[in-house]
Structure formats: C-alpha cells, structure tokens
C-alpha cells in the first residue's frame, strides 16, 4: 500500500484527507495540518514547510482544530444574563457557564446566551424533573394521590400526607393536593359540626 | 502594518439602503473579529455589531437586529455592513474597526470612517 | 447591554495641570478568575477615528505617552492626564468588551482653559 501523504501535501480536489485535523491552502494548492486545541498558528505552512503552532497567551483560548493566527480572548460568564460559571477559561476551552439556580436557558445560540427565571408551579402541583438543570422552563404536573404542595414555587416538590396514626394521633381533615392531612389527639372530640356522626 | 480602508462617502434617501465596505491589508484578515461603530454628528460611539470571517459568524447590538446585516468575503479581504429602513437618525460616520491582541478583544485598529447622509 | 457612563462631559483644564475623567458600568467588568478589568480607554479627535490608548483598565498602549494612566476596578475607573498639552485637547471614551456586546461611554470632551 502507498505510504500516507504527511502534510505539506498536493491537493488537486481542494479536500483534504483529514478534514478535522488539516486544511486547504489555496495559495499552494496544498493540505496543510492545523494546529491542535489550546494553539494557533504562528507560521503559515508552505510547500515545504507544515504549520507551525505556538500556545496560546494567557487568557485567551482556541477549542478545536484551527488555522487561526491569533487566539479568544476569555470571557466571563454574564451575571446579568442570569449566568455563573461552572469551570474557569483554559488555553483549550472557553469559560464553562451555566444558568443560575432557579433560572433556565431561554435564548440559545452555540450555547446558552441568556437565563430567564423559572416559572412558579402553583400549589397542588410541582416542576416536573428535567434530565438537564436550566435547559428549559418549569412544566408543572399535579401531585400524585396521597401527596401535596402548598405554595407558589419554581422548586417545591410535593411532599407525601402525614399518616395521622403513624403519630399516634388521628385524622381529622384528609388531605388534598394543595394541603397536608390534618390529625387530632384521639381524645379531643370531634369539632361540632363532625358530632352527628357518632354514636351516641 | 494593518490598514483598514473603507469606501466612501453615500447620499442615500429614506426607507433605502446602504452597504459600506472595509478592506483589510497587512494582517490576517479571517482570523479576526470585525466591528462596526457609527457616530452620529456631534454624538458619541455606538456599537453595531461584527463579524468573526473565518467563522462566518455575526453578533449584533439588539437595537438594529433585522436592520443590519454584517458580511465578510475572506478571498478579497472585505467586511461589509449593510443597513437597511434608512430614516434621517442614521446620519453618521460609519467606522470598522478589529483588535490585534486576541481574535475578539478591545479594538486596536480602525478605518478612515465612511459618512452616510440620510436626506429627502 | 452593560452600560457606560461618564463623568463629567466636559472639562476645562490649564496647560501643564491634571486632567480626570470618570467611567462607571452598570455591572462589573471585573473577570475574577484573571482580576482582569475589561475595559478600555480611546481618545478621539476631531475628523479622525477613534485611538485606542488604555487597555485591561490600567495598560498604556505602545506609543501612548506617560502622562497617560488608568486606574479602577469593578465598576468604577478613572484616566488621569498628568500634565495636559495643547495636543490633547480631544473626546475620551471608555469602553468594555467584558461581553462581545461592545458599549461605550458618552464621550468626555477636554479642552484647555
């Protein structure tokens, strides 16, 4: 088999064999490497010279395969557009953000661009739990049977009906989807409007 | 040394367009991000947005989004921004203008400057 | 958008006497990771483009003579001419490029008294 072309090498086409990691010149009419993350070029390639990658200065950065001459400078996460940062700037990689708590991506772009406030759920219900924090605003869903949530919140999670007995105590209200059972010493008699139905 | 040369000066009516060009020379002009920074008479400096032309990607200021449109043409080292819906307020001296330390960073280098009138 | 404001818009100041001029932003543009201010100054003259002569808040630009300095952090930042000459008679701006959202100050003019 034919041994593989190390750049510098002759494109006729205008493609390269290494898309990721390699570039047409169309100056020379040839495929040349690009330099790795975390670089840029600082000497272009000629017929009989390849790229020739320098490091990239302190703050500022390049992420991918490039033929970039200079680098990015870093940048913060914007707490105005409701982001914090997750992990700092690195020569191989911009600042990491990510929206703040209680706040989900509502402009995207790339990346997250922009957070808005999550949605309160109101009582009786709770956010349905998403694989990702901040990808999307709250989509509320009604408590199960036999739990409740008893506020207007983007975060509150239905909690189960306190079991009276488990207290040695008994019921007095049952509980509902926006309100939690309410129990009563078993000594304490019923309130009067309840008094009919026992018996005598 | 980097020169950015722009073209000239325009009498455009209202409701027209307008396209200004940049041409860059003695540095990489794809590797760059190219700004657009008008002045109105009198006023001060107004960012209006850029463009990164090896990415091919633009950014622009939210008061003239879908009025302006940045392009960049890498082959003959040319940035271009089109305005569009002119109205007598957008009488200015239109400026490019690019960094020189990092791709996106304060800008170091700008062009003479381009005097669009808006006038019936 | 962080929004710039400068203080105050005009300045009359002697030859040879220290000139201040003042910049607020309406958020910090202070990067705690590199305590690096994002900000710039430019000085502008009359018919020409603007001239970069600040950056990082407090480093001169090659060229920029001396008697030019930046200082502040946050929000708050100041360029201090030490001793004006007639050739600085011009508007200054600040600027931040913090996000790529690029925004400027409403210009400061100095003139001789």
């Known amino acids: 088999s034919q041994p593989q072309a190390v750049p510098p090498y002759a494109s006729e086409n205008q493609t390269c064999r290494d898309q990721e990691k390699e570039y047409y010149e169309p100056q020379h009419r040839i495929c040349c490497s690009r330099c790795p993350p975390g670089t840029y070029v600082s000497a272009k390639c000629s017929r009989i010279r390849d790229t020739v990658c320098a490091t990239c200065a302190e703050n500022s950065y390049n992420e991918h395969w490039n033929y970039l001459t200079i680098c990015q400078l870093c940048r913060p996460c914007d707490p105005v557009m409701g982001l914090e940062e997750i992990a700092p700037c690195t020569s191989k990689r911009k600042t990491q953000c990510r929206c703040q708590p209680g706040m989900f991506c509502a402009a995207w772009a790339l990346e997250c661009t922009h957070c808005e406030l999550l949605s309160d759920c109101p009582p009786g219900t709770e956010a349905e739990l998403k694989d990702e924090v901040g990808k999307g605003n709250n989509h509320c869903v009604p408590c199960k049977a036999g739990h409740f949530q008893n506020t207007s919140s983007p975060s509150a999670r239905c909690q189960p009906h306190t079991r009276c007995e488990n207290q040695g105590l008994v019921e007095a209200a049952p509980g509902t989807a926006q309100s939690d059972t309410t129990c009563k010493n078993p000594l304490e008699p019923l309130p009067p409007e309840m008094s009919g139905t026992m018996l005598m | 040394q980097v020169q950015l040369v722009q073209s000239g000066a325009e009498v455009k009516k209202p409701g027209s367009s307008v396209k200004v060009s940049c041409k860059a020379s003695g540095g990489t002009f794809s590797s760059y991000a190219i700004s657009w920074v008008r002045q109105a008479p009198g006023q001060g400096l107004e960012w209006m947005g850029g463009i990164i032309p090896i990415f091919g990607t633009a950014n622009y200021a939210q008061k003239f989004q879908g009025r302006v449109t940045i392009t960049a043409d890498k082959s003959t080292s040319t940035a271009y921004m089109e305005l569009s819906s002119l109205r007598s307020e957008d009488t200015a001296v239109y400026y490019c203008?690019?960094?020189?330390?990092?791709?996106?960073?304060?800008?170091?280098?700008w062009g003479q400057g381009t005097t669009v009138t808006v006038s019936s | 958008d962080i929004v710039m404001t400068q203080s105050p818009d005009s300045l009359a100041v002697s030859l040879g006497e220290r000139a201040t001029i003042n910049c607020k932003s309406s958020?910090?543009?202070?990067?705690?990771?590199?305590?690096?201010?994002?900000l710039a100054w430019y000085q502008q003259k009359p018919g020409q483009p603007p001239k970069l002569l600040i950056y990082?808040?407090?480093t001169r630009e090659s060229g920029v003579p001396d008697r030019f300095s930046g200082s502040g952090s946050g929000t708050d930042f100041t360029l201090t001419i030490s001793s004006l000459q007639a050739e600085d008679v011009a508007v200054y701006y600040c600027?931040?490029?913090?996000?790529?959202?690029?925004?400027f100050g409403q210009g400061t003019k100095v003139e001789i008294k």
């Open positions: 203008a690019r960094p020189s330390y990092y791709l996106d960073g304060w800008l170091d280098y």
């Open positions: 990082w808040a407090s």
């Open positions: 600027s931040q490029y913090y996000t790529t959202h690029y925004t």
């Open positions: 958020q910090s543009v202070l990067y705690s990771s590199n305590n690096k201010n994002y």
